[in-house]
Interface confidence: low
């Protein structure tokens, strides 16, 4: 399955939107920094394309879920959020098209399930952190920065998959 060039551009636009969403400086949130334990190994180059598509899909789905809550709507600029949803939705469609074509369905299901579970646990830790911090502006900024980082890493994986073809 060939992910369209627009998917790659969409990933870059998503990162740009996340950067634009910044409302306060991380420097003013020193005390709120947190280690969420992003499961970087699940996005390693050792994966075949068949194994990565569902993991990438899960990652983007979880980002969508995180930023489409009522608390998120109150924290961020509405116009930027709408654009952000649109970009994520398009990327989910692109990845789902690949899954429908059979890529990522047949091989090593256990490995994929473990990876998807690791991604879900990562987002559970983020959600719990936000709850504990009572969805404060600093907590959201820490999360925005973390998502920028993890999304950037998963985007990099997509690019490496492209170049291996």
């Amino acid at each position: 399955c060939d992910l369209p060039q627009t998917h790659s551009l969409g990933s870059r636009r998503t990162l740009m939107l996340l950067a634009q969403m910044r409302r306060i400086s991380l420097f003013s949130c020193l005390k709120d920094r947190h280690d969420f334990g992003f499961p970087q190994e699940e996005f390693g180059n050792q994966f075949q394309k068949a194994e990565t598509i569902p993991v990438l899909h899960e990652m983007i789905q979880q980002i969508f879920n995180l930023f489409s809550t009522k608390d998120s709507s109150a924290a961020w600029d509405e116009t930027l959020l709408d654009k952000f949803y649109t970009e994520l939705y398009q990327q989910l469609n692109d990845l789902e098209a690949c899954v429908i074509q059979g890529v990522g369905v047949t091989e090593t299901p256990l490995m994929k399930e473990d990876s998807i579970l690791a991604v879900r646990k990562y987002f559970q830790r983020i959600t719990l952190y936000l709850k504990e911090k009572k969805y404060s502006p600093c907590a959201w900024e820490v999360v925005r920065a973390e998502i920028m980082r993890s999304f950037s890493l998963s985007t990099n994986l997509q690019e490496s998959l492209r170049s291996k073809e």
């Epitope: 990162l15 950067a19 991380l26 420097f27 020193l30 005390k31 920094r33 947190h34 280690d35 969420f36 334990g37 992003f38 970087q40 820490v142 999360v143 920065a145 973390e146 920028m148 980082r149 993890s150 950037s152 890493l153 985007t155 990099n156 690019e159």
Partner: antibody
């Protein structure tokens, strides 16, 4: 005020061992990504090692892997660098640094630097 | 490992000049790039992170741009206190490598 205070200068023989310490004030090392960066006399900056906010992840430059160990004591709010099998090329000013960012895999710059401690390895 | 190449390695300029320093990564680092200023005998100081975000308290004459592999640090109008050595650093993946530095001297 956010500050990092490193231990004093040291002179060691090749093959020797040394532990650098770095006491933090104004913030907690347990919730920050902490790093060690070094600079040999007249040379550029060289990233040495880092430890994640939880302490669960540690990272090393290839040239110190297996010889240096980064750790911290949360109760003392102190970062450490245990240096074993020292070589002449380890001679440098060692800086203890904290980072802008969030989490084990995210930071975008080293924002708070200690004053640096000179480590000299010579026979 | 990601290699960071800075150019030029040294530069002579005058007060009031506009100066540009470039940094190239051997592979894409997104916007995970920082710039530091270091004066002799002092610890480095963070100027810019996230490729273009000005660190708190840093004068607005400093600016950063770029994404992926090519980055620039620009000083719009050099001041006497800006003569120092400048380093870039990628924080995309470990080891978080630094560039070799650019020494900015008075012409």
């Amino acid at each position: 005020e956010v500050q990092l205070l490193e231990s004093g200068a040291e002179v060691k023989k090749p093959g020797g061992s040394l532990r650098l310490s770095c006491a933090a004030s104004g913030f907690t090392v347990s919730s920050n990504y902490m790093s060690w960066v070094r600079q040999a006399p007249g040379k550029g900056l060289e990233w040495v090692s880092a430890i994640s906010g939880s302490g669960g992840s540690t990272y090393y430059a290839d040239f110190v892997k297996g010889r240096f160990t980064i750790s911290r004591d949360n109760s003392k709010n102190t970062l450490y660098l245990q240096m074993n099998s020292l070589r002449a090329e380890d001679t440098a000013v060692y800086y203890c640094v904290s980072s802008v960012g969030a989490g084990a895999y995210y930071y975008q710059g080293l924002d708070v630097w200690g004053q640096g401690t000179l480590v000299t390895v010579s026979s | 490992d990601i290699q960071m190449t800075q150019s030029p390695s040294s530069l002579s300029a005058s007060v009031g000049d506009r100066v540009t320093i470039t940094c190239r990564a051997s592979q894409g680092v997104g916007n995970f790039l920082a710039w530091y200023q270091q004066k002799p005998g002092k610890a480095p100081k963070l100027l810019i992170y996230g490729a273009s975000t000005l660190q708190s308290g840093v004068p607005s004459r400093f600016s950063g741009s770029g994404s992926g592999t090519d980055f620039t640090l620009t000083i719009s109008s050099l001041q006497p206190e800006d003569f120092a050595t400048y380093y870039c650093q990628q924080s995309y993946s470990t080891p978080f490598t630094f560039g070799g530095g650019t020494k900015l001297e008075i012409k």
